[in-house]
């Protein structure tokens, strides 16, 4: 995991400010609200997780 | 580095209650979901309960095993969650440990704390 | 809720063999883009530990022996070479809804 303006976060992650790390692209289906999301927006956005079937 | 520490497990008969408490640190507790998971030698691991954010309202999501007699609760300035558990029965007799997730990966678990239901 | 099925149950490896553990859900736990499955280590007498994130993402300082794969129903846990250190029993956990479960476990020995 990389501090902003050194290497870049790892591929499928982005960095988050609010957390000071790389964070996984894969759980904005489930936070999409999360700062680092921006970040991960060559991603397509998925649904939002289902709670209960 | 991150510390998990659950405690107020022990022996209760069945139909009885029980509080368990788990600190944490070592995170940014107040930006993680917080969850309850169990093991025991029949049923392995079950996740038990999950509560959310301020921001979220503190929703909160029980396993069918748990809805209507278990409640989690957390309190922020103390970095704490907590699983109040009543009417007890002796399947609810696990190891019970405490998990951080951001969103789907249970990031650390605590030593766990045992609870045992029986007369 | 989503049934996770691993095999084999048991297993024993040599030292420095492959170890490989199956991890079968009862729908897919996968988008276009990711995979909604982890992986965790639990040694005799300790906590569970994250392994493997969204299905072979590997969690810091995991070492890199270990290798997840898969996607849809189907997902597969490697390790190789196996270390004697590996001797603990392997969960696989999917987070695609709610309830989250596991599944039954595999435990490694190694000879």
């Known amino acids: 995991e990389q501090a902003p303006g050194t290497a870049p976060c790892s591929r499928g992650s982005s960095w988050s400010a609010d957390l000071d790390k790389c964070m996984d692209c894969a759980s904005c289906r489930a936070r999409p609200h999360s700062d680092f999301c921006q970040g991960c927006a060559a991603a397509p956005p998925a649904p939002f997780r289902l709670l209960w079937p | 580095e991150v510390k998990l520490g659950e405690s107020g497990g022990g022996l209760v008969q069945p139909g009885g209650s029980m509080k368990l408490s788990c600190v944490a640190s070592g995170f940014p507790f107040t930006k993680y979901w917080m969850n309850w998971v169990r093991q025991s030698p029949e049923k392995g691991l079950e996740w038990v309960a999950e509560?959310?954010?301020?921001?979220?309202?503190?929703?909160?999501h029980y396993a069918e095993s748990a809805k209507g007699r278990f409640t989690i609760s957390r309190d922020d300035s103390r970095s704490s969650v907590y699983l109040q558990m009543n009417n007890l029965r002796a399947e609810d007799t696990a190891i019970y440990y405490c998990?951080?997730?951001?969103?789907?990966?249970?990031?650390?678990w605590g030593q766990g704390t045992s609870v045992t239901v029986s007369s | 809720d989503i049934v996770l099925t691993q095999s084999p149950a048991s297993l024993a490896v040599s030292l420095g063999q492959r170890a490989t553990i199956s991890c079968k859900a009862s729908?897919?736990?996968?988008?276009?883009?990711?995979?909604?499955m982890q992986w965790y280590q639990q040694r005799p007498g300790q906590s569970p530990k994250l392994l493997i994130k969204?299905?072979?993402k590997l969690d810091s300082g995991v070492p890199a022996r270990f290798s997840g794969s898969g996607s849809g129903t189907d997902f597969t846990l490697n390790i190789h070479p196996v270390e004697e250190e590996d001797t603990a029993t392997y969960y696989c956990?999917?987070?695609?809804?709610?309830?989250?479960?596991f599944g039954g476990g595999t435990r490694l020995e190694i000879k």
């Open positions: 509560i959310r954010l301020k921001s979220d309202n503190y929703a909160t």
């Open positions: 956990q999917h987070s695609w809804e709610l309830p989250y479960t």
């Open positions: 729908q897919s736990v996968s988008t276009s883009t990711y995979s909604y």
């Open positions: 969204y299905a072979s």
């Open positions: 998990s951080p997730t951001y969103a789907d990966t249970m990031d650390y």
